[in-house]
């Protein structure tokens, strides 16, 4: 044969012509169309690596490669077919037209569709094992996947079952979270109650503290009873003793009368050579009884005998009689010595009286009465003054004539009213008069228009309350 | 017998000045203190100052600034000076001394003028 | 310390018990609440001091009570004399009146 040509006709069909002699030989063959063309980049029967391929175009893929061999195996069914039918009209025409030289021809003919068959067969094989090689991967992608799946499956399992025990754990707590308010409100409520119930206990307390106080001034006043009794008691055992003693030098004139050293006031404690300041045990005129003072050793030649101290407020001097009569507060501190002390005192030799004064200003003044003296209980304990000196102001704020001492429950004042009641205080109180040094104690800032504090009014005037005073008496010939 | 008898009362414009004086007797006026207290017509009492025995004065915030009390102890004598009156400054102006001798502001009052009638008026 | 008596106006015959109540808006100590009795065209009279104490001439009819914030002055028979205006002041470091209570003929 002289030439084969291969062309595509108008509507897509492979045509085979073959040019013999005079005769030509046209096949029509029906196209692949889903199968790839032989210059198409693909090697056959390459092993391809796995591409990381979605699971559902894996799925498209191999549906799509079904249908291709599904195609093929028609398309070789039908040129199967073909062939024969035209084997079969050849050999007819052969045999009819009896032409013996074509036969050759139709052998060549024949030989080349069987090649051709062949080729395409071969060319499915390839395909087939394209498919395969396709599949095998699709199938191993697959499993990948359904591994990878039943892994992730695995995790969102684990993942659900944490998050459930999260949620149990959350509303456990929760719960518990729920208690704890529950329990912190009824501890709340509970907490109120006991305050309320501490502040009951608190101000029944304070009642208490109240009454224990009145006890103890009470006691207080009982005790300095007690201890005068046991002072006159002393006083008689020690004058039974003497007695005794006398008695018995009389008959045995060896025994030695003990001599006892005792001081009446500071003046007695300086001049024995006891110059420093301090709380000193003096003891009363004409007897045994004792009492502790402060004596100024340093101040003015010093021997002073401190009978009164406001100096901070910590003793409270709106005080009984009683009280003032046997003294109160700490001779270290705060305090009045007592009035029989200071009567038999005084009554005893002349005293001179010394009254220091400080007001908030950082300011002092003092007023120096020559002679000083208290009457008997008998008489109030009515003050005696006379020859004012000193920086306190040229009138005396100590009433002239002098006053007797009034206390909250002894008013012997010359006022309608109870002067101690309304300006507090034991004092020597006139009508009410233009001092009262045992007054209400007022802190700074708080010490003016306060009419009922520690005056000295021909210093301060009435309404200035006095930060500190002290009252101190001497003999007049120290 | 205590006595104390106010006077110096009348009429005046506001903005105007007027001086009350208040005789004492029967005490030692050297001894206590002495206070004005006011009473508007139909009206309730009102303190308006107050002295001591050696001077010390004491005024409400009403007051202060524009009313100055003073004392004469030798005449027995308590004065008011009263400036820059007000129309509320109208009243019955008394005197009156302190229950208790020194007592500044801590007393009630035992003994009191008649009154002086104060009238702020244009 | 602001004082507030009550009632404004009694309206009692003679003979009767008049109970007349003065509140103090704080605490206040009974020594220093004294009653004022005035009469039209006259001087207040002091009648009690320090709560519960009768000045010097005054009947025993009159008295005085109460502590803290509450006090009482009680008129325990009602005289002709006695219709007048009460006063109740307190005096502690200050001045101050209440307004004032009148007892009238009912």
């Known amino acids: 044969y002289n030439n084969f040509r291969k062309s595509m006709d108008s509507i897509g069909k492979k045509q085979y012509q073959v040019q013999h002699g005079s005769c030509s030989y046209t096949f029509l063959l029906p196209e692949m169309d889903n199968c790839r063309s032989s210059s198409s980049p693909y090697v056959s029967n390459a092993v391809q690596r796995d591409a990381p391929l979605e699971y559902d175009d894996s799925v498209q893929r191999l549906q799509v490669l079904e249908n291709i061999m599904e195609n093929n195996t028609q398309w070789l069914m039908k040129l199967e077919n073909y062939i024969q039918d035209n084997m079969k009209k050849e050999m007819v025409e052969i045999q009819q037209n009896a032409v013996q030289n074509q036969t050759a021809v139709m052998i060549e003919i024949g030989t080349n569709l069987l090649n051709q068959t062949a080729e395409q067969t071969r060319k499915l094989t390839d395909v087939e094992a394209q498919v395969l090689n396709q599949t095998t991967r699709l199938e191993l992608q697959l499993l990948e996947h359904s591994l990878s799946t039943n892994k992730l499956e695995k995790q969102i399992l684990d993942q659900t079952s944490e998050i459930n025990k999260l949620q149990d754990k959350n509303s456990f707590l929760e719960k518990k979270v729920l208690a704890m308010e529950d329990k912190h409100i009824i501890q709340l409520q509970s907490i109120k109650e006991e305050k309320d119930q501490l502040q009951v206990l608190v101000s029944k307390q304070n009642s208490i503290i109240e009454e224990l106080e009145k006890k103890i001034v009470t006691a207080t006043v009982n005790n300095s009873v007690l201890q005068k009794q046991q002072h006159d008691l002393m006083e008689t055992v020690n004058n039974l003793l003497t007695m005794m003693s006398t008695s018995n030098s009389a008959k045995d004139p060896t025994v030695a009368k003990e001599e006892q050293i005792s001081f009446r006031d500071c003046a007695e404690v300086f001049k024995s050579g006891h110059t420093t300041n301090g709380i000193y045990t003096l003891t009363f005129p004409n007897s045994t009884e004792e009492i502790k003072a402060y004596c100024d050793m340093e101040a003015g030649g010093g021997g002073w005998t401190i009978i009164q101290r406001r100096e901070d407020g910590s003793v409270d001097f709106q005080r009984t009689w009683k009280e003032y009569k046997v003294g109160f507060g700490n001779p270290s501190g705060e305090y009045w010595l007592g009035n029989e002390f200071v009567s038999q005192l005084t009554n005893q030799q002349r005293y001179v009286l010394k009254i220091h004064l400080k007001d908030w200003e950082g300011n002092e003044a003092y007023s120096l009465y020559e002679h000083f003296y208290l009457s008997s209980e008998e008489l109030n304990y009515r003050i005696h003054l006379k020859g004012l000196t000193g920086t306190a102001g040229k009138i005396s704020s100590i009433s002239q004539p002098g006053n007797d001492f009034s206390t909250k429950d002894g008013d012997n004042d010359k006022c309608i009213c109870k002067c101690s009641q309304m300006l507090t205080g034991g004092w020597w109180f006139d009508a009410c008069g233009p001092s009262n040094l045992n007054g209400m104690y007022y802190p700074q800032r708080q010490n003016t228009n306060k009419f009922n504090g520690i005056k000295w009014y021909y210093w301060k005037g009435s309404g200035y309350s006095l930060k500190a005073t002290t009252m101190m008496i001497r003999p007049a010939d120290f | 017998a205590v006595q104390l008898v106010a006077s110096g009362g009348g009429l005046v414009q506001p903005g105007g000045s007027l001086r009350l004086s208040c005789a004492a007797s029967g005490f030692t006026f050297s001894s206590y203190d002495i206070h004005w207290v006011r009473q508007a017509t139909g009206k309730g009492l009102e303190w308006v100052s107050a002295?001591?025995?050696?001077?010390?004065?004491y005024y409400p915030g009403s007051v202060k600034g524009r009313f100055t009390i003073s004392r004469e102890n030798a005449k027995n004598s308590l004065y008011l000076q009263m400036n820059s009156l007000r129309a509320g400054d109208t009243a019955v102006y008394y005197c009156?001394?302190?229950?208790?001798?020194?007592?500044?502001?801590?007393?009630?009052?035992?003994?009191w003028g008649q009154g002086t009638l104060v009238t702020v008026s244009s | 310390i602001v004082l507030t008596q009550s009632p404004g106006t009694l309206s009692l015959s003679p003979g009767e018990r008049a109970t007349l109540s003065c509140r103090a808006s704080?605490?206040?100590?009974?020594?220093?609440l004294a009653w004022y009795q005035q009469k039209p065209g006259q001087a207040p009279r002091l009648l009690i001091y320090g709560a519960s104490s009768r000045a010097t001439g005054i009947p025993d009819r009159f008295s005085g009570s109460g502590s803290g914030t509450d006090f009482t002055l009680t008129i325990s028979r009602l005289e002709p004399e006695d219709f007048a205006v009460y006063y109740c002041?307190?005096?502690?470091?200050?001045?101050?009146f209440g307004q004032g209570t009148k007892v009238e003929i009912k």
């Open positions: 002295i001591g025995p050696a001077g010390d004065t």
């Open positions: 009156a001394r302190g229950l208790i001798t020194f007592g500044g502001l801590i007393a009630p009052f035992d003994y």
């Open positions: 704080q605490s206040v100590s009974s020594t220093y």
């Open positions: 002041q307190h005096y502690d470091n200050s001045q101050t």
